[in-house]
Interface confidence: low
């Protein structure tokens, strides 16, 4: 009978510089000796080496040398004795390219070379980036382990060295940043910064390095209202708007935060379960109403926690007046005027552009005041007739603008005469 | 074969700028940073910095930075050095050189001799 | 920045002979270290990285030795060819610096 020799193993494979690769191997030999049981030795060559003589790569028996260069890194993997020859190669180099061949020998009757099924080892440069493994999402405040390694690396050869660079890490001991492991407790400005871990192997110039940019949870820590795109100052987690009466408002809420915050507009102060008046940051309103006075709050939904802000509407007005108009009466000539602002307003009377301040000391005229609802009422007594034509004029004010109106009053054919001339000057 | 070919001797005035440059070949050009270095008559070697063709990321030097600026083109494996506001002080030979595979082999350019004179 | 001091500037050998160069860094480079040699007209060419390993080709006289400050080249069995000069280049920080060089002459 023939005897069998046979070598199963990939003809070649590719490695890239400084990583490991395992090759898979299995042969067969004929053996066939009950009476004795010399040890199984096996190694492998560098093609075209006189194994009598050559060092090995790798081998099982201990008085074989093996090539200093080769020494640690291509090691036998697995058992012989079940006929496994799988080489293991650790830290290749680019002088480790070339084809390598399989031998067996075991007592006096076993001594083969399996030459028809060399394996070829192909090192090429290193492109392998490095991983960088953690948990996400990343949530801020919260510790994370992050790991770096790099595919296909292998405890072989010189060790490796690691450096962590980006913004998260600024408050980080140097020394825990040369880890291959670091822990990281991300901040809110921390998301979309980017974080590199940057490998080398010791006694090497060139250096490997990978990118991630962060993606950090946070719940909104702040909120800021705009109005015409300038925020408005929040005290207390309350805001304070003075609006003008029958202007249009557009007011948008913001509230940063990863994935982005649910912002809604509230009238008033809410309960947890209130309806809003607006699903999104933005609140219209086509034309402000005093009755609008009072607040509004926008509220800030995030799945790490909610935040919300109460905004004071203040509805101002500039002052509406009637009048003034004037007839004769008993007592002498009757003025009124009606106004209507929001705060309320000043009022005072002139005539002919002298103001009459309270009520006159010679009893010449007087002044009464009085409001109800929005509307304020004055009313000013002439004593006496006109000796000539006469302006009377009377403003209010407040300090968002004033409005004064004027009638003029004409002499009539006698004193009693009632011709008034309304004029807005 | 790896190649690093620069461009040839340059002859400028001061307050002029120059560029050099230097053609990649045998590898592939984005894998590796390409170095720069200057070496002035009968002195020692100073680097200038570096440049990842990959992104175009430079780091330099801070004594040369505002003087060379560094740019590559990836389509014609090509690295650049301009050198600007020349004095007599920049005249020197400028490499190029690169570390090649896991262990950094040194590849160097044959160098540019840049002289500054009026 | 890192400063790599080569103190002697010029060394005398004959063939045959064992020569030491040095190189001082300013602060601790670990074994960060290169070894060039620079013939007259020629680019540097890289002889030894990480203080002692051998580039691939590099005749087995060329040895490099030391850690933290210190370094040595040593060339045992100077040949002619070795005429040349030789810098020592530290890689542990950026910039990378190079010391001033040691021209070496065959007597």
């Known amino acids: 009978e023939k005897p069998v020799y046979e070598l199963q193993v990939q003809k070649s494979v590719t490695v890239q510089e400084g990583l490991c690769v395992l090759v898979p191997c299995s042969f067969s030999y004929p053996w066939r000796s009950w009476y004795s049981s010399p040890p199984l030795y096996v190694y492998w060559f560098r093609d075209g080496e006189i194994p009598y003589y050559a060092e090995v790569v790798a081998t099982n028996n201990p008085d074989r040398r093996v090539k200093p260069e080769t020494q640690g890194r291509f090691r036998l993997l697995g058992d012989v004795q079940k006929k496994n020859c799988s080489l293991s190669i650790g830290d290749a180099r680019m002088e480790d390219t070339g084809s390598y061949f399989f031998r067996v020998e075991r007592g006096r009757d076993v001594k083969y070379s399996y030459q028809q099924n060399k394996l070829n080892l192909e090192v090429t440069a290193l492109i392998e980036k490095p991983d960088i493994h953690f948990l996400e999402p990343l949530e801020s405040g919260r510790p994370t382990r992050l790991s770096c390694s790099l595919p296909g690396s292998c405890e072989a050869g010189p060790p490796l060295t690691f450096s962590w660079t980006g913004n998260a890490l600024s408050p980080l001991d140097p020394e825990t940043t040369r880890s291959s492991e670091l822990t990281l407790t991300p901040r809110p400005e921390d998301h979309g910064t980017n974080l590199t871990c940057q490998m080398k192997r010791q006694g090497a110039q060139v250096t490997t390095e990978r990118t991630v940019q962060l993606n950090v949870s946070y719940a909104p820590q702040t909120i800021t209202i705009f109005r015409n795109g300038i925020a408005l100052e929040i005290l207390q987690n309350t805001s304070y708007l003075p609006v003008l009466e029958g202007q249009a408002l557009r007011l948008l809420c913001d509230a940063p935060s990863n994935p982005p915050a649910h912002l809604s507009w509230f009238q008033g102060s809410p309960a947890l379960n209130a309806t809003p008046i607006s699903n999104t940051g933005i609140l219209e309103l086509r034309r402000v109403r005093s009755a609008e006075e009072g607040g509004f709050t926008c509220r800030a939904q995030h799945p790490l926690g909610f935040l919300q802000i109460f905004l004071n509407l203040s509805v101002y007005s500039l002052p509406q007046l009637l009048g003034p108009s004037c007839s004769w009466e008993a007592e002498g000539l009757h003025c009124r005027c009606s106004f209507r602002a929001r705060p309320a307003p000043s009022l005072c009377w002139r005539l002919e552009e002298k103001p009459l301040e309270g009520n006159s000391s010679q009893g010449s005229f007087k002044v009464n005041s009085s409001s109800a609802g929005p509307w304020a009422n004055s009313s000013l007594i002439l004593h006496g007739g006109l000796s000539s034509d006469l302006k009377v004029s009377c403003k209010a004010w407040n300090i968002y603008g004033s409005q004064s109106g004027s009638v003029l009053l004409l002499q009539g054919r006698s004193n009693l005469g009632t011709g008034v001339v309304p004029a807005a000057l | 074969e790896i190649q690093l070919q620069q461009s040839g001797p340059e002859l400028v005035k001061p307050g002029a700028s120059v560029k050099v440059s230097c053609k990649a070949s045998?590898?592939?050009?984005?894998?590796?940073?390409m170095y720069w270095v200057k070496q002035s008559h009968g002195k020692s070697l100073e680097w200038i910095g570096y440049?990842?063709?990959?992104?175009?990321?430079?780091t330099y030097n801070q004594k040369f930075k505002g003087k060379a600026t560094l740019t590559v083109d990836k389509s014609s494996s090509t690295a650049f050095m301009h050198l600007n506001s020349l004095t007599s002080e920049d005249s020197a030979v400028f490499y190029c050189?690169?570390?090649?595979?896991?262990?950094?082999?040194?590849?160097w350019g044959q160098g540019t001799l840049v002289t500054v004179s009026a | 920045d890192i400063v790599m001091i080569q103190s002697q500037k010029f060394m005398s050998t004959s063939v045959g002979d064992r020569v030491s160069v040095t190189c001082k860094a300013s602060?601790?480079?670990?074994?960060?270290v290169a070894w060039y040699q620079q013939k007259p007209g020629q680019s540097p060419k890289a002889l030894i990285y990480?203080?002692?390993y051998r580039y691939s080709g590099v005749p087995d006289r060329f040895t490099g030795s030391g850690s933290g400050t210190d370094f040595t080249l040593t060339i045992s069995n100077v040949q002619s060819e070795d005429l040349a000069e030789y810098f020592c280049?530290?890689?542990?920080?950026?910039?990378?610096?190079f010391g001033s060089g040691t021209k070496l002459e065959i007597k």
């Open positions: 050189a690169f570390y090649y595979g896991y262990y950094g082999v040194p590849y």
């Open positions: 280049q530290q890689y542990n920080s950026f910039p990378l610096t």
């Open positions: 440049i990842d063709p990959y992104n175009g990321g430079t």
């Open positions: 045998g590898y592939s050009f984005t894998d590796y940073n």
């Open positions: 602060q601790n480079v670990d074994t960060n």
């Open positions: 990480s203080a002692s």
